[in-house]
């Protein structure tokens, strides 16, 4: 196994008052591949609302590395090929579970989180406010 | 909560053999309040690749109740309203993280599953293949 | 840019143990997995076994099952293999390679191998 | 465990011929594919990995394509650097595993 800096303040595995803690096991299972394998590799350059990918970074959390989509347009692409300001591209986000060790440093404790991200981008028409 | 038949084969919390097991504590922590309120909740309706949401409901995953989107056309709308079939509407798809019982109905014990899911659509240039 | 550097040469004779290190530099340690992979002369690549460093949890290859074992030590950055009862076919390079583990392009996690150490050549001969 | 099984084995081409190695996975691996590139006496480099995704800094003459269980590995115009073997590898499922390779000559 791996060997860590041991947080002195671990919880103990056995402690019953650990809140809502469950035993997990982390091998962990993928459902996917028997699934469409029609994945959206190339999307963020061929859609209408192309994004570009964004390295975010946190060592305490699984996965460590998230690459966030960010929209590379206010506008959407025409059929010509240029930027229509009439329409807007938008991040279409998803909440996601990570992992984060906790305390920080422990290996066998860790928290379930919620994150928002941002997986891809869509061309919406725009909400037009008109003033009286 | 829910309240689920105990298997009687639930794996014991202090099972040192139980395999590559950890603590997670399940009292989710959301990173998300403070982030922009502005969701994507209406874009499935005004995207020029519009999407409907389905939802799948699983007992014995967690989240329980997971959402997914399904391309309400093959072409994307354009700006008359109308299908455009030179286009298609795409799902933009990504793999999560969610809790499976395992064994069936214990309820302090989980694995990790990786599934994949459609988060929403975008509008893409079809790829043209030239026969010779 | 991550680099991967590994110990020197080997030779060993048969029964004997052995325990390559790979040293990484550069990205965060914690957040990626180190795969073992040998390859014997003039053959293929043969994955054996890898560590992911987040949960110091541990596959290995049905192969080499009892008789590899993975390690890492976060404090210095170096993922260890060790490899048991050395036989004459054990003779090979033994690569370690980065599993990134990143949420990336509609994957929870990405398992390439992206960045691979020089290579430490085994020799098991009596 | 997965099988994959890659043809040909060898390849001898003319420099700018186009080059197409296939990969052929025993059972659906969705586009958990990856390809390497290892020069004689050399580590292996990773050239395309998710079947078709490119990676920074190989040159855009290398692509991938596929998903299920048939890939292909193209080379558009082979260069004398191109020389060496090339291999598949799956990470849908453990353990991951390896084709036998292809290894590309240059006439």
């Known amino acids: 196994g791996i060997t860590i800096p041991r947080n002195p303040g671990c919880p103990n595995s056995e402690d019953k008052n650990f809140p809502r803690t469950v035993m997990v096991n982390l091998n962990i299972h993928n459902r996917n591949t028997n699934t469409n394998p029609k994945r959206s590799s190339d999307y963020y350059n061929r859609s209408t609302s192309p994004w570009n990918l964004h390295r975010n970074e946190d060592p305490e959390r699984y996965p460590s590395v998230i690459w966030e989509a960010k929209c590379r347009h206010l506008g959407c692409i025409n059929a010509d090929g240029n930027v229509d300001y009439h329409m807007n591209s938008v991040p279409i986000q998803q909440e996601i579970l990570v992992l984060r060790r906790e305390p920080p440093h422990c290996p066998n404790s860790f928290r379930l989180e919620k994150i928002l991200v941002s997986v891809g981008c869509t061309c919406v028409t725009p909400i037009v406010h008109h003033v009286a | 909560g829910i309240t689920i038949p105990r298997n009687p084969g639930c794996p014991n919390s202090e099972d040192k053999n139980f395999p590559r097991t950890v603590m997670v504590n399940l009292n989710i922590h959301n990173r998300n309040t403070n982030t922009n309120p502005k969701r994507s909740s209406d874009y499935y309706n005004r995207s020029t690749s519009p999407w409907n949401l389905h939802r799948n409901e699983d007992p014995e995953r967690y989240p329980s109740v997971i959402w997914e989107a399904k391309c309400r056309h093959l072409g994307c709308i354009n700006a008359d309203g109308n299908v455009d079939y030179h286009m298609n509407s795409v799902p933009i798809q990504q793999e999560i993280l969610v809790l499976r019982r395992e064994p069936p109905h214990c309820p302090n014990s989980f694995r990790l599953e990786k599934i994949l899911v459609s988060v929403g659509c975008t509008c893409v240039t079809p790829i043209v293949h030239h026969v010779a | 840019e991550v680099q991967l550097v590994q110990s020197g040469a080997e030779v060993k004779k048969p029964g004997e143990s052995l325990k390559i290190s790979c040293k990484a530099s550069?990205?965060?340690?914690?957040?990626?997995?180190i795969s073992w992979v040998r390859q014997a002369p003039g053959q293929g690549l043969e994955w054996m076994g890898g560590?992911?460093?987040?949960?110091?949890?541990?596959d290995y290859a049905q192969k080499f099952q009892g008789r590899v074992t993975i390690t890492a030590d976060e404090s210095t950055t170096t993922a260890y293999m060790e490899l048991s009862g050395l036989t004459s076919d054990d003779t090979a390079v033994y690569y370690c390679?980065?599993?990134?583990?990143?949420?990336?392009?509609?994957?929870?996690?990405?398992?390439?191998?992206?960045?691979w150490g020089q290579g430490t050549t085994v020799t098991v001969s009596s | 465990e997965i099988v994959l099984t890659q043809s040909p084995d060898f390849q001898s081409v003319t420099p700018k011929e186009k080059v197409t190695i296939t990969c052929r996975a025993s059972?659906?691996?969705?586009?958990?594919l990856h390809w390497y590139q290892q020069k004689p006496d050399q580590s292996p480099k990773l050239l395309i990995k998710?079947?078709?995704y490119s990676v920074s800094g190989v040159p855009s003459r290398f692509s991938g394509s596929g998903s299920g269980t048939d890939f292909t590995l193209t080379i558009n115009g082979l260069e004398a650097e191109d020389a060496g073997t090339y291999y598949c590898?799956?990470?849908?499922?453990?353990?991951?595993?390896f084709g036998q390779g292809t290894k590309v000559d240059i006439k």
């Open positions: 390679a980065r599993e990134p583990n990143e949420f990336w392009n509609g994957y929870y996690t990405t398992h390439d191998f992206d960045s």
């Open positions: 550069g990205g965060s340690f914690i957040s990626y997995g």
């Open positions: 560590i992911t460093h987040f949960f110091g949890s541990t």
């Open positions: 059972q659906a691996i969705g586009s958990e």
């Open positions: 998710y079947a078709s």
């Open positions: 590898h799956q990470s849908a499922s453990l353990p991951y595993t």
